[in-house]
């Protein structure tokens, strides 16, 4: 019989990548049913042969973790999904070319906010990724992006904010009023890759000044 439109069974095949965790996702088309099964293959750009992803063959869920298989930062990848309906109809769709460096988004950083009497200290903890170095250690975002910055803002009142930023991990906002609440926001920025994380937020109160009591 004449081949049907693949979109009837399968739609929106794409990588969703965050902090270098690379998940292939897709939707069923209008003809898809709960018993439609999906099989996933991937390949490196420039290679001819597709590789079947173990653990993602004839599955019914609509996602597959390809983090390990697409973990080389210098390579480009494709993945494809083949959907087979209960009635034996099949459709295959391929992703756009995927680069984890280019396409990954950044999660908010992990930050410790420390209250003092007249200052607030913010310590940013390096963000681990699933990518392993040769020595087995997990790489951090700092290991991957040379031009990575932390951007910190302290909301002092409705009209005034203080800003700090750089490649360091430790910052301190000085000259604050004791026993006062402040809102801090901290973001990771990699301007050379046009990346900006969602903010981490901490609401902190400076300590009361006990020297006058």
């Amino acid at each position: 019989h004449a081949p049907e439109d693949p979109s009837d069974l399968l739609q929106h095949v794409k990588f969703q990548s965050s902090n270098f965790e690379n998940i292939l996702t897709w939707d069923s088309g209008p003809e898809g049913t709960p018993d439609t099964v999906y099989s996933i293959e991937y390949k490196t750009y420039g290679e001819r042969d597709w590789v079947a992803k173990k653990g993602c063959q004839r599955i019914t869920r609509k996602s597959c973790n390809l983090t390990v298989e697409t973990g080389n930062l210098t390579e480009l990848y494709y993945a494809r999904v083949t959907a087979v309906s209960a009635g034996g109809r099949s459709a295959t769709k391929m992703t756009d070319r995927f680069s984890s460096l280019q396409h990954t988004t950044l999660k908010p950083p992990d930050v410790t906010c420390i209250s003092k009497v007249r200052s607030i200290q913010m310590i940013v903890h390096p963000t681990p990724t699933p990518i392993r170095a040769g020595d087995g250690h997990r790489l951090t975002l700092e290991d991957i992006f040379h031009d990575l910055f932390y951007h910190l803002e302290l909301q002092v009142n409705r009209t005034y904010q203080m800003h700090l930023g750089g490649k360091q991990r430790e910052y301190e906002f000085f000259g604050l009023t004791p026993d006062t609440e402040f809102l801090g926001t901290i973001m990771i920025c990699v301007p050379t890759w046009a990346k900006e994380s969602a903010p981490y937020m901490c609401r902190v109160k400076t300590l009361p000044d006990r020297t006058w009591t």
Partner: antibody, heavy 117, light 109 residues
Framework: EVQLVESGGGLVQPGGSLRLSCAAS????????MYWVRQAPGKGLEFVSV????????HYVESVKGRFTISTDNAKNTLFLQMNSLKSEDTAVYYC??????????WGQGTQVTVSS | DIVMTQSPSSLSVSLGDRVTITCQAS????????LAWYQQKPGQSLKLLIH???RLQTGVPSRFSGSGSGTSFTLAISGVEAEDLATYYC?????????FGQGTKVELK
């Protein structure tokens, strides 16, 4: 105390090769960004290359791409710069430097590279 | 590449003078003001004075100060001392390749 000691400089003919080394101590070498920076006689300073010692990610300035290779031996806390197809304009003092706590604050004393026939 | 234009190229000063050196970036170096100032004395490597455009590095005398944002930055020495006679460089630490200004040589009149 952080220490960076360069070696391997010398006189070489145009088209020749040289391998610079930088022995590092006093910090966690295996998770740092390490740099080669050069200063030509009477000229300014130029960053040549950088490597992350954990990820192995490297960057080069355009003028040395395809000729220079930066690498490390993490077991020996040593940074290298393999320089091939050398040109007279590569003549300079070559410094290694490192970024610690976000700042490029530690530099070696430099090693002289002279490319001349 | 970001080009850093530093001026003047040299300065003749008397001890105690206030000195200002400027650095202009060919494009904005970000809201984090990723600019550093270094001092180099003959036959020596570089010493970090200022980072983040205005933050004094630990151990650097308070007569040194930095200011500016976006594309325009200034290093000031409030009262030059003999040990300050050196060449000063700005560095943009925003995007690879990191680039220096051409340097300003501060010497005695």
């Amino acid at each position: 105390e952080v220490q960076l000691v360069e070696s391997g400089g010398g006189l070489v003919q145009p088209g020749g090769s040289l391998r610079l080394s930088c022995a590092a101590s006093g910090f966690t070498f295996s998770s740092s960004w390490m740099y080669w920076v050069r200063q030509a006689p009477g000229k300014g300073l130029e960053f040549v290359s950088v490597i992350n010692t954990r990820s192995g990610i490297t960057h080069y300035v355009e003028s040395v791409k395809g000729r220079f290779t930066i690498s490390t031996d993490n077991a020996k806390n040593t940074l290298f710069l393999q320089m091939n197809s050398l040109k007279s304009e590569d003549t300079a003092v070559y410094y290694c430097a490192t970024r610690i706590q976000g700042l490029i604050d530690y530099w070696g004393q430099g090693t002289q590279v002279t490319v001349s026939s | 590449d970001i080009v850093m234009t530093q001026s003047p190229s040299s300065l003749s000063v008397s001890l105690g003078d206030r000195v200002t050196i400027t650095c202009q970036a060919s494009q904005s170096i970000g809201s984090v003001n990723a600019l550093a100032w270094y001092q180099q004395k003959p036959g020596q490597s570089l010493k970090l004075l200022i980072h983040g455009a205005s933050r004094l590095q630990t151990g650097v005398p308070s007569r040194f100060s930095g200011s500016g944002s976006g594309t325009s930055f200034t290093l000031a020495i409030s009262g030059v001392e003999a040990e300050d006679l050196a060449t000063y460089y700005c560095l943009q630490d925003y995007a690879w390749p990191l680039t220096f200004g051409q340097g300003t040589k501060v010497e005695l009149k």
